[in-house]
């Protein structure tokens, strides 16, 4: 009873949980659960029954496809959702969907830890600050990405005159959104207005 599918969505959005295959023909009952034992809704050939749960009032079941529509998902809705179908033969079949709800990333703030002019070179240490999020960082100098090994929350590099950039951008992203923050320097190595 495998059928595990992963879904990542942005918080506040409306989500459709469904399976890629068609439902067993003339099934007897269909149930959606979250966290393995909490029933959300059940359909039994006559009607859909919505149970007391945190989803009540913001879910809808389509008995034809088995799709479960959830409105305004929040991070607290992160869970493994299970669709269980009781077939006319008496057998059950299950499908699992692991739903990850992520907040859109906030706009990062670039903090200048250190700028130092060193014999025509510019030592630069910038940190990209966002509140406690698990995100990916990409640094750009005048829209050109820095090498992969420099891609984390702190950019620490020594620039030579031929590869000075005027503006430095930190892009933070997760699988549902991305935001940029930028600081600009005045050549050769001083802070300009953002």
């Amino acid at each position: 009873q495998g059928h595990l599918v992963h879904m990542t969505v942005v918080s506040g959005s409306n989500v459709t949980l469904n399976i890629s295959e068609s439902l067993p023909e003339n099934y007897k009952q269909l149930t959606w659960f979250y966290t393995f034992d909490q029933k959300i809704v059940e359909w039994d050939s006559r009607k859909s029954k919505y149970f007391e749960s945190k989803f009540k009032g913001r879910v809808r079941l389509d008995p034809q496809s088995g799709a479960l529509y959830i409105s305004k998902v929040q991070k607290e809705d992160n869970s493994t959702y299970i669709m269980r179908v009781l077939k006319k033969t008496g057998n059950e079949q299950e499908w699992k969907i692991k739903l990850q709800v992520l907040d859109p990333v906030p706009k990062p703030v670039i903090k200048i830890e250190k700028i130092e002019d060193m014999d025509d070179n510019c030592y630069l240490k910038l940190s990209c600050v966002i509140p406690g999020e698990s995100v990916n960082y990409t640094w750009y100098g005048d829209k050109r990405p820095f090498p992969k090994e420099l891609q984390n929350s702190v950019l620490e590099t020594t620039l030579m005159p031929h590869n000075y950039s005027r503006c430095y951008t930190c892009q933070v992203s997760n699988s549902v959104s991305s935001k940029n923050g930028t600081v600009c320097l005045s050549p050769p190595c001083t802070l300009a207005r953002s």
């Epitope: 009952q29 149930t31 059940e42 029954k49 149970f51 749960s53 009781l86 057998n91």
Partner: antibody
Framework: QVQLVQSGAEVKKPGAAVKVSCKAS????????ISWVRQAPGQGLEWMGW????????NNAQKFQGRVTMTTDTSSSTAYMELRSLGSDDTAVYYC??????????????WGQGTLVTVSS | DIQMTQSPSSVSASVGDRVTITCRAS??????LAWSQQKPGKAPKALIY???SLQSGVPSRFSGSGSGTDFTLTISSLQPEDFATYYC?????????FGQGTKLEIK
Amino acid sequence: QVQLVQSGAEVKKPGAAVKVSCKASGYTFTAYGISWVRQAPGQGLEWMGWISAYDGDTNNAQKFQGRVTMTTDTSSSTAYMELRSLGSDDTAVYYCARDRYSSSSGYFDYWGQGTLVTVSS
Amino acid sequence: DIQMTQSPSSVSASVGDRVTITCRASQDISSWLAWSQQKPGKAPKALIYAASSLQSGVPSRFSGSGSGTDFTLTISSLQPEDFATYYCQQANSFPYTFGQGTKLEIK
């Protein structure tokens, strides 16, 4: 964890009625059905009927038709089974059992501990 | 009503043995069959549903098979706690009916 706790043993006179309760905990009561099954001393299991805790829909075995009433109280997550016009052959242990579905599938996943009902003059 | 017939009525076996209990329905019930275990003075405990699906928490030494009218419950290697009475039950149609039980005793 899921628990079905039944009321205590009863001794009844022939012709009387008995009402057995089954208090559920550890799950959303209305999301499952409850069946009632009895077992006479030294005998096998006999299904009496089923009730949906969601909407009170019932189905009783023909043998008990007109003599058994199954109800639920969702506010206390309790199912009840009342059996009337008791005879000595109704002496048995009465069990409640949770159905895997809110509409009866006939698959019972949890059982109460049983209530002994003795009918004796 | 659908009649359920179990065989044998009782069986003696030793710890470590493989035991098979059979159940026959009086008409085709597809896979609508459950097995339960009952120890003296205790409530039944669900073992198998849908002929072959193991209830949550039940050891994997228990297995069920069959469809239509003939079904089997197999205990692959008997443990001391497995000595009990086993019932099959059809869930195909109302009224749900049970087999008469198979008592598994220590040899």
